[in-house]
């Protein structure tokens, strides 16, 4: 969370940004809020990126002004125009790429004053893991797969029954480069699993952490998975 203050004469406004992460190959959002101003035509929003000449996006007098926009952002950016009056200056970024990572500045000017705040935008790939029972193996095993990760994550297994146990000796993890030569498919196999136990496959890099749980009983298999972004907020 970064809060910036700006001074305009005697007036300053608070601009707040949140460190956020973009999943490459999807739309992303760079979050920025400011003190609301009901006079939409008096609001100017400028997004800048460190090391880039020209603007990422500009919104003023109630509409986009892309005349100064850098070409790497052409056709890819948008503010949430209907939410500007309530203080939302967040930027939508279409088809996030690795190269979009960096330090951005959200600059605001309103009739109340001006202010800005920086935002660290991380880009990578993260996806939900899926765990399945591998019946083909000589002993019953679990296979945890996640289709897209970058940078290369760590993978760890845990179990409800054997809490604190180290499963590195009875698991095998591989990383297969995907066709676009950036992201990788993660596959981890846990051997010698026992029935009536809950196992967790945890995949983590510096951007996100995902966990897949599986409970295998005689009568059913229950699965659950979750994903959380790290260092955001």
């Amino acid at each position: 969370l970064i809060i910036g203050f700006g001074i305009s004469g005697k007036h300053f406004i608070t601009v707040t940004t949140f460190t956020s992460a973009g999943n490459i190959g999807e739309d992303g959002t760079l979050s920025c809020t400011f003190e609301p101003d009901i006079k939409l035509n008096g609001i100017v929003i400028q997004w800048l990126k460190e090391g880039i000449k020209g603007l990422v996006h500009e919104f003023k007098e109630g509409k986009d002004d892309l005349s100064q926009q850098h070409e790497m952002f052409r056709g890819r950016t948008a503010v949430f125009a209907d939410q500007v009056v309530v203080g939302n200056a967040s930027l939508r970024l279409k088809n996030v790429q690795l190269t979009d990572a960096g330090t951005y500045t959200c600059y605001i000017r309103t009739s109340k004053g001006k202010g800005n705040a920086n935002l660290e935008y991380k880009t990578g790939a993260f996806s939900m893991p899926e765990i399945n029972v591998d019946y083909n193996a000589s002993s019953e095993s679990l296979r945890c797969e996640a289709p897209r990760w970058f940078p290369q994550p760590t993978v760890a297994w845990a179990s409800q029954v054997d809490q604190g146990a180290n499963f590195s000796e009875v698991s095998n993890t591989s990383f297969e480069l995907n066709s676009e030569n950036v992201t990788m498919k993660v596959v981890s196999v846990l051997y010698n699993v026992t029935i009536n136990n809950t196992y967790s496959c945890m995949i983590e890099n510096d951007i996100a952490k995902a966990t897949g749980d599986i409970k295998v009983t005689d009568s059913e298999v229950k699965r659950r998975s979750q994903l959380q972004l790290l260092n955001s907020g």
Partner: antibody
């Protein structure tokens, strides 16, 4: 050369199924937003579906539940699986790459749904 | 869902004249996500303008785009015989959803 080539269209009876293919060359399908857009005879363009680089998919309400967009990264090919076909699905189907907009289009493949 | 309405439905002009095509959105559209396409009979659409005003690769400079918010315009400054075709505007929305206008037919007078 950047190119998209569709195939798989044809005459199909109502209720039938069809799989359209779109082979890409000169770029990687999995790095782009890839779309299917259709055009009924004498009508305008209608967006059907998109698959993001991440694999996330979205569909127009008119086809939701009846079509599935997918891709085979090893073949650099986009697909549209169409089920429960109706007469109103009769159209030329185009695949299109979206970078900053739909900048590359295939030549289209014709689907005719009729008994 | 955002609806794009193009006008006029048909525009009859002569080569050498200026053509102005309008695209109106039912709610505000980001300029970045507004594009124009040209389609000739029996052919696939061709991207002309993206980001409301940026010309796509290989598009002659007689084609220009402008506008923001809910009102966008495609202008062809001096019509050439090969410009007579159907023109579509299109937006990338927040559903996410792509929407096309119904098209404007530009015909020879």
């Amino acid at each position: 050369e950047v190119q998209l080539v569709e195939s798989g269209g044809g005459l199909i009876q109502p209720g039938g199924s069809l799989r359209l293919s779109c082979a890409a060359s000169g770029f990687t399908v999995s790095s782009n937003y890839m779309n299917w857009v259709r055009q009924a005879p004498g009508k305008g363009l209608e967006w059907v579906s998109v698959i993001y680089g991440s694999g996330r998919t979205y569909y127009a309400d008119s086809v939701k539940g009846r079509v599935t967009i997918s891709r085979d990264n090893s073949k650099n090919t986009l697909y549209l699986q169409m089920n429960s076909l109706r007469a109103e699905d009769t159209a030329v189907y185009y695949c299109a790459r979206d970078t900053y907009a739909m900048d590359v289009w295939g030549q289209g493949t014709t689907v005719t749904v009729s008994s | 869902e955002i609806v794009l309405t193009q006008s006029p439905g048909t525009l009859s002009l002569s080569p050498g004249e200026r053509a102005t095509l309008s695209c109106r959105a039912s709610q505000s559209v980001s300029s970045s996500y507004l594009a124009w396409y040209q389609q000739k009979p029996g052919q696939a659409p061709r991207l002309l303008i993206y980001g409301a005003s940026s010309r796509a690769t290989g598009i002659p400079d007689r084609f220009s785009g402008s506008g923001s918010g809910t009102d966008f315009t495609l202008t062809i400054s001096r019509l050439e015989p090969e410009d007579f075709a159907v023109y579509y505007c299109q937006q990338y929305g927040s559903s996410p959803m792509y929407t096309f206008g119904q098209g404007t037919k530009l015909e020879i007078k």
